[in-house]
């Protein structure tokens, strides 16, 4: 299932980096977020919980990223006018189910005044 | 069609050790949490252990713990049971099983493990 | 740890008739919107099958006569038509936190 562009603010700056910010609904518990740069798996992150229903956090794809109980954000760093595209956050529900994919993501513009350590 | 086909059980004297495998297939095993279930001849169903998907977090039943230790290889898609320090009362058929997210999704047909002199 | 008891220890019910089982927990098994309660079926010489995950979500593949019920403490399995196939122990089991237990398991048999 492909949602198209994301209904929110995707991407914050801030000190030369991006904070690329993927939602999920609330009452998901079991998931797996990629964030896709064109078609290319940037990062990853998987929250799943055992029969003892302890919380498993896996990264494959390991960017900085930060949990929590509606979204994960990753963080790119040292932005330059390659970060330029278009960024997808791939998310794959697993539990509750039905399993479900959603595609949510947005063009992120590089201007000037957003770059890490320019020249003056 | 997932399967899982359990091995390793036996006769074993008391205090003697016994290695279980769960062969699996049909599945991305390194995507599951995996589990050992066991029920005493005649007697309900009594869960045993745990592991996560890559082996790094372990859960133990307050029974076992100290002396079961369980593993698993991801290359060979195998689930393991080490059973240290057995006792008359771990007589049981041990079911290898995945959590497939919110429940035990799929079980082996057992392993009879015999602990007697 | 959270103890599971069930009731009755065994029933006999004729064919076509219902059969209800009832599981209670120790402690609510409810969190947020989910009830971690789940039902195995157990025939004689076989390993469980998962029957009803989430208190009454059935498992696909599993017949419509199978239902569960319930919310926080109180559980309920029921066969609205047992049929000869479904003469089987069935179990409830928890995992709301470590350990996950079952209850001690309900024998049905036809009458």
């Known amino acids: 299932e492909i949602n198209g562009s994301a209904n929110y603010e995707m991407f914050i700056f801030h000190n030369g980096g991006v904070q690329i910010l993927c939602k999920y609904p609330d009452i998901v518990q079991q998931f797996k977020m990629q964030l896709l740069k064109g078609g290319q798996i940037l990062c990853d992150l998987t929250k799943t919980k055992g029969s003892g229903n302890t919380v498993s956090i896996k990264s494959l794809k390991f960017c900085h990223s930060q949990l929590s109980n509606n979204s994960v954000s990753f963080f790119l760093y040292n932005l330059d006018h390659s970060h330029a595209n278009y960024y997808f956050c791939n998310l794959s529900i697993f539990d509750p189910p039905p399993f479900k994919v959603t595609l949510t993501g947005g063009y992120l513009h590089i201007y000037e005044s957003q770059l890490c350590c320019q020249l003056k | 069609e997932v399967q899982l086909v359990e091995s390793g059980g036996g006769l074993v004297q008391p205090g003697g050790s016994l290695r279980l495998s769960c062969a699996a297939s049909g599945f991305t095993f390194s995507d599951y949490w995996m589990d050992w279930v066991r029920q005493a001849p005649g007697k309900g169903l009594v869960w045993v252990s745990n592991?996560?998907?890559?082996?790094?977090?372990?859960e133990y039943s307050p029974f076992v713990k100290g002396r079961f230790t369980i593993s698993r290889d991801n290359a060979k898609n195998t689930l393991y049971l080490q059973m240290n320090s057995l006792r008359a009362e771990d007589t049981a058929v041990y079911y290898c099983?995945?959590?497939?997210?919110?429940?035990?999704?799929?079980w082996g047909q057992g392993t009879l493990v015999t602990v007697s002199s | 740890d959270i103890v599971m008891t069930q009731s009755p220890d065994s029933l006999a019910v004729s064919l076509g008739e219902r059969a209800t089982i009832n599981c209670k927990s120790s402690q609510s098994l409810l969190s947020g919107s989910f009830n971690y309660l789940t039902w195995y079926q157990q025939k004689p010489g076989q390993p469980p099958k998962l029957l009803i995950f989430y208190a009454s979500t059935r498992q696909t593949g599993v017949p419509d006569r199978f239902s569960g019920s319930g919310s926080g403490t109180d559980f309920t399995l029921t066969i609205s038509s047992l049929q000869a196939e479904d003469v089987a122990v069935y179990y409830c089991h928890h995992h709301y936190n470590a350990p996950p237990t079952f209850g001690p398991g309900t024998k049905v048999d036809i009458k």
């Open positions: 099983s995945r959590w497939g997210r919110f429940a035990f999704d799929s």
């Open positions: 592991i996560d998907e890559d082996g790094s977090i372990a």
